[in-house]
Interface confidence: low
């Protein structure tokens, strides 16, 4: 049986049930190579409370559809009068990066995961030449996720004192120059995640090979190497390599750009101070507020919720967008789709799409940017579920009683972008964490 998602095969992935202090290792094409789970375990569960391991999915007992992967075991669930077996079930949804498997829940018999990944899309528009896992769990099982830093087109310019060269990098995947053929990047070789531009020439100085690693709680490392043989003539016989160290700052701060800290014989060391290197609970909330000791800030967007069936309306040329954030009030136009953002075609108001659902909500505050994300909307032709990204700005003189109003700024591959100036986005900072 052919592997259903070959792009995901090269790695053993991790997911965590934080409530029960359980770490899962997942290898969807082979086995996880953990002795305690046996030789053919595809999903190995490490219970850190009891310090035990259990195989909860066998690679031999795999069944797959386009969007669901199930691994059975021969282990009985011991439920009275039933013949159920322990199994793992992974639901795949189209995403714009390789993504991460997320633990959803576990019943006594079944361990459920959800995975938004390019591997599950109907079209290849989001697929990279080369991409590696871009998240890691620290020793306290807290997730550090750099997926939001991955550029689907273009690259980051590294801050470097050399006026004759420019070093461009992407995070965890190669630089896509086709989707964004900027003049400097156009010459970058395919597959490169670190491209050195000198004059009109561009050189591959590193490609992603291994996933993100954690070296200390607040320091993550990504290494790129030049895969192909043949040395570059300016490298003194050495093979180029790039090491990017992502550092979680000791207190809340604006974002910085990656800085070159050392360079010798085409070995480049880059340091990037970014809150995306911090653990995810420090940055994100599933509600419309972020507060408490853990986050160092107080943010509450719940006053933006509309009551009485009214919605915010944002004009998007061909479409009108109806938004109802931070609540569970149905948008009247949106036909009981549980939409937080609803897209209605002006020329045909029967064409209605959910552009993100209110129970699929993430509030994120990172590197000084406050963003509310609604995902899980109606599918586009690629298989990607529409989503909306609302970027908030603090404005203490915003109209509409300080609430302000969302402004549609554009759409890229079924992701809809809005900006929203409001006094409720003014962040109150606490002491550092």
């Amino acid at each position: 049986q052919a592997a259903p998602f070959p792009e995901l095969c090269s790695y053993t992935w991790e997911a965590v049930d934080t409530k029960n202090n359980v770490l899962y290792k997942i290898n969807i094409c082979g086995s996880v190579d953990i002795v305690q789970c046996g030789p053919s375990s595809a999903v190995c569960m490490h219970d850190l409370k009891t310090r035990t391991y259990h195989s909860v999915g066998d690679s031999v007992l795999r069944s797959a559809t386009r969007s669901l992967l199930e691994f059975n075991t021969t282990v009985s669930c011991d439920q009275q009068g039933t013949n159920h077996r322990v199994q793992s079930s992974i639901a795949f949804l189209c995403g714009k990066t390789l993504g991460t498997p997320e633990f959803v829940t576990a019943t006594f018999c079944v361990h459920y995961f959800e995975w938004r990944t390019t591997a599950a899309c109907k079209k290849d528009i989001f697929k990279a030449n080369k991409e590696v896992p871009c998240y890691v769990f620290d020793e306290e099982l807290r997730k550090h996720d750099l997926n939001p830093l991955i550029k689907l087109s273009g690259a980051y310019l590294v801050d470097d004192s050399d006026p004759d060269t420019s070093l461009f990098i992407n995070v965890c995947r190669d630089i896509d120059t086709l989707r964004d053929p900027g003049s400097q990047l156009r010459a970058c070789p395919p597959g490169t995640a670190a491209c050195l531009v000198r004059g009109h020439q561009a050189f591959d100085v590193g490609q992603p090979r291994d996933g993100l690693k954690v070296v200390r709680k607040d320091r993550l490392v990504l290494s790129y190497v030049r895969e192909e043989a043949g040395k570059l003539d300016f490298c003194d016989g050495h093979s180029p390599a790039v090491t990017i160290t992502f550092v979680c700052p000791s207190e809340r701060r604006e974002g910085t750009i990656p800085k070159l800290t050392a360079k010798s014989n085409c070995r480049y060391e880059i340091e990037w101070i970014t809150e995306y290197a911090c653990h995810r609970d420090y940055l994100e909330s599933k509600t419309c507020s972020l507060s408490g000791e853990q986050q160092d800030v107080s943010i509450d967007l719940t006053p933006l919720a509309q009551s009485g069936g009214s919605s915010y309306i944002s004009d998007g040329k061909e479409y009108l967008f109806y938004l109802n954030v931070c609540g569970e009030t149905e948008i009247q136009f949106c036909n009981k789709k549980q939409a937080a953002v609803c897209q209605v075609k002006k020329s045909d108001t029967s064409q209605v799409k959910a552009a993100g659902r209110y129970h699929n909500q993430t509030l994120r505050y990172s590197d000084g940017d406050l963003t509310l994300i609604y995902f899980g909307g109606d599918e586009c032709s690629s298989g990607f579920q529409r989503m909306s990204v609302i970027n908030f700005e603090c404005n203490k003189t915003a109209g509409n009683d300080g609430k302000g109003t969302p402004v549609f700024t554009g759409e890229v591959d079924c992701t809809y972008f809005f900006t929203w100036d409001t006094e409720y986005a003014c962040v109150h900072h606490h002491h550092h964490h």
Epitope: Q36, D47, T52
Partner: nanobody
Framework: DVQLVESGGGLVQPGGSLRLSCAAS????????MDWYRQAPGKQREWVAT???????TYADSVKGRFTISRDNAKNTVYLQMNSLRPEDTAVYYC??????????WGQGTLVTVSS
């Protein structure tokens, strides 16, 4: 001292039953995955059954439906109930405790002979 001690082996006729016990000392018994293995004369040691700490059980195809693994946490003991025994079940039976924080611990074995 960490150790496992098996007992309950002996001579039994085909179709008969035996219950093997494996008593553990020096380990947090309930934290460990417990396995039974067996080794017939002149053959490789083979896995028989597993009882994970959650109570999940799994068996080798050759014993499925005939053998049952269970545990008594209060007595720090794991059992292997063997019914409908066959001559090919003749072997030394070993229990093993698996823990991520300790090396695997094996018992010294108990001999089961199935013969008429």
């Amino acid at each position: 001292d960490v150790q496992l001690v098996e007992s309950g082996g002996g001579l039994v006729q085909p179709g008969g039953s035996l219950r093997l016990s494996c008593a553990a000392s020096g380990i947090i018994f309930s934290d460990n995955r417990m396995d039974w293995y067996r080794q017939a004369p002149g053959k490789q040691r083979e896995w028989v059954a597993t009882l994970a700490s959650y109570g999940w059980k799994t068996y080798a195809d050759s014993v499925k439906g005939r053998f049952t693994i269970s545990r008594d946490n209060a007595k720090n003991t794991v059992y292997l109930q063997m019914n409908s025994l066959r001559p090919e079940d003749t072997a030394v039976y070993y229990c093993k405790a698996s823990s991520p924080v300790l090396n695997d611990i094996w018992g010294q074995g108990t001999l089961v002979t199935v013969s008429s």
